[in-house]
């Protein structure tokens, strides 16, 4: 997977008045990394791993960048000539990626009241607008505002692309993201299903990086894909991931089944607990 930096900013207007303040979150490699603390008006790291990325350096640069981006987005919202009654939101998501072959991608997406209305490839400066008439109108409003100074705009997009990549490289240089490995906690549970059957669930949690193999085996052989049910691999809010896999088996055959887990070159197998013991938890 590529390394990525994702900025997510939201500003609000109420009855046509753009509200002060903004919401901002930054994700690094898909993990919550920074958020803007509205009380303290500062960028704050999300968890210990995020603090480790910059070590003892301050977050002044991130605070300044997010504050500037929030101000720009508020000005953009002020130029949207749309429904003025009630509460409305303008969200900007900006993503840059560095792939294994060192190629890069950058994009920017605008959402109004949660609906995507404008996307841009920051490298080619190519715009994409959904077909709906509302999206077309909103996109025209925003593009006209952004294009008021054409040369400034061109420089602006190039800078956004370059700045995002520069920040991403800066974070990666710390080595924290690249070398971090947190082994999963594996937890097997059973629950009653239909008569004569039980559902066994294998959960892996608190692991990093994201890539993991989690599958049920019968007599040492992996079950077919269609006999298992998988959960998505999702961030758990602590800079690590979680996922699960479940299958249905005949009661009495529990000892034939094991959950197989492979992560960062290590692997382990985990048995189904007997009926008396509900949960078996192990950290390999």
């Amino acid at each position: 997977e590529p390394h990525s930096l994702r900025y997510n900013l939201t500003v609000l207007s109420w009855d046509g008045s753009v509200q002060s303040g903004f919401l901002a979150e930054v994700h690094l490699d898909g993990q919550p990394f920074l958020r803007y603390d509205r009380q303290k008006c500062r960028a704050k790291p999300q968890g210990q791993w995020a603090e480790d990325v910059l070590g003892n350096k301050t977050w002044d640069r991130e605070t300044r960048d997010l504050t500037g981006n929030g101000k720009d987005l508020r000005m953009t919202l002020a130029h949207i000539k749309d429904q003025k009654e009630g509460l409305h939101s303008l969200q900007e998501i900006r993503v840059c990626e560095i792939h294994e072959d060192n190629s890069t991608r950058s994009s920017q997406h605008f959402y109004y009241d949660g609906e995507l209305f404008l996307s841009q490839n920051l490298e080619t400066e190519e715009w994409t607008v959904p077909q709906s008439s509302r999206a077309q109108t909103l996109a025209m409003n925003v593009r006209n505002f952004l294009k008021e100074d054409a040369m400034k705009t061109k420089t602006h997009y190039h800078a956004m692309h370059a700045d995002c990549l520069q920040e991403l490289r800066r974070y990666l240089e710390s080595g924290v993201v690249l070398r971090r490995t947190v082994p999963p906690m594996v937890n097997v549970t059973r629950s009653e299903a239909s008569e004569g059957n039980i559902t066994v669930t294998c959960r892996a949690s608190s692991f990093y990086p994201r890539n993991i193999i989690l599958t049920w085996r019968q007599d040492g052989v992996s079950l077919s894909h269609d006999t298992q049910q998988w959960g998505d691999v999702l961030p758990d809010g602590n800079g690590t991931y979680q996922t699960w896999v479940a299958t249905r088996i005949c009661r009495g055959e529990e000892q034939r089944f094991t959950c197989y887990m492979e992560h960062s070159g290590n692997h382990s197998t985990h048995p189904v607990p007997s009926g008396k013991v509900l949960v078996l938890q192990s950290h390999w």
């Epitope: 429904q83 009654e85 009630g86």
Partner: nanobody
Framework: QVQLVETGGGLVQPGGSLRLSCAAS????????IGWFRQAPGKEREGVSC???????YYADSVKGRFTISRDNAKNTVYLQMNSLKPEDTAVYYC??????????????LGQGTQVTVSS
């Protein structure tokens, strides 16, 4: 009968203060976003401020830094503290529920309102 009753208006000199109250009867305000809007003679209804059930507040540009909205769920009342009043704040002030919706002013039931007059 479900209704919102506005009180606290009056005549005040420029630079003065007033505190408006919006009391609910027949239902509890706890779960509602409650807002104030105003209407001056010959003008459209204009949103003033809004407070959500969890205490988030929103203000019109024209009143930011001068007006403060608050709520007291125990008293089933929402307040609008108006400081540094200006002649252009003169209007009838109404409160209404669901001030986050995109038709909250348009569809609002007009109660008696409370008249605020700022004049020397």
């Amino acid at each position: 009968q479900v209704q919102l009753v506005e009180t606290g208006g009056g005549l005040v000199q420029p630079g003065g203060s007033l505190r408006l109250s919006c009391a609910a009867s027949g239902f509890t305000l706890d779960y509602y976003a409650i807002g104030w809007f105003r209407q001056a003679p010959g003008k459209e209804r204009e949103g003033v401020s809004c407070i959500t059930s969890d205490g988030n507040t929103y203000y019109a540009d024209s009143v930011k830094g001068r007006f403060t909205i608050s709520r007291d769920n125990a008293k089933n009342t929402v307040y609008l503290q108006m400081n540094s009043l200006k002649p252009e704040d003169t209007a009838v002030y109404y409160c209404a529920a669901d001030c986050l919706s995109s038709t909250w002013r348009t569809n609002a039931y007009l109660g008696q309102g409370t008249q605020v007059t700022v004049s020397s």
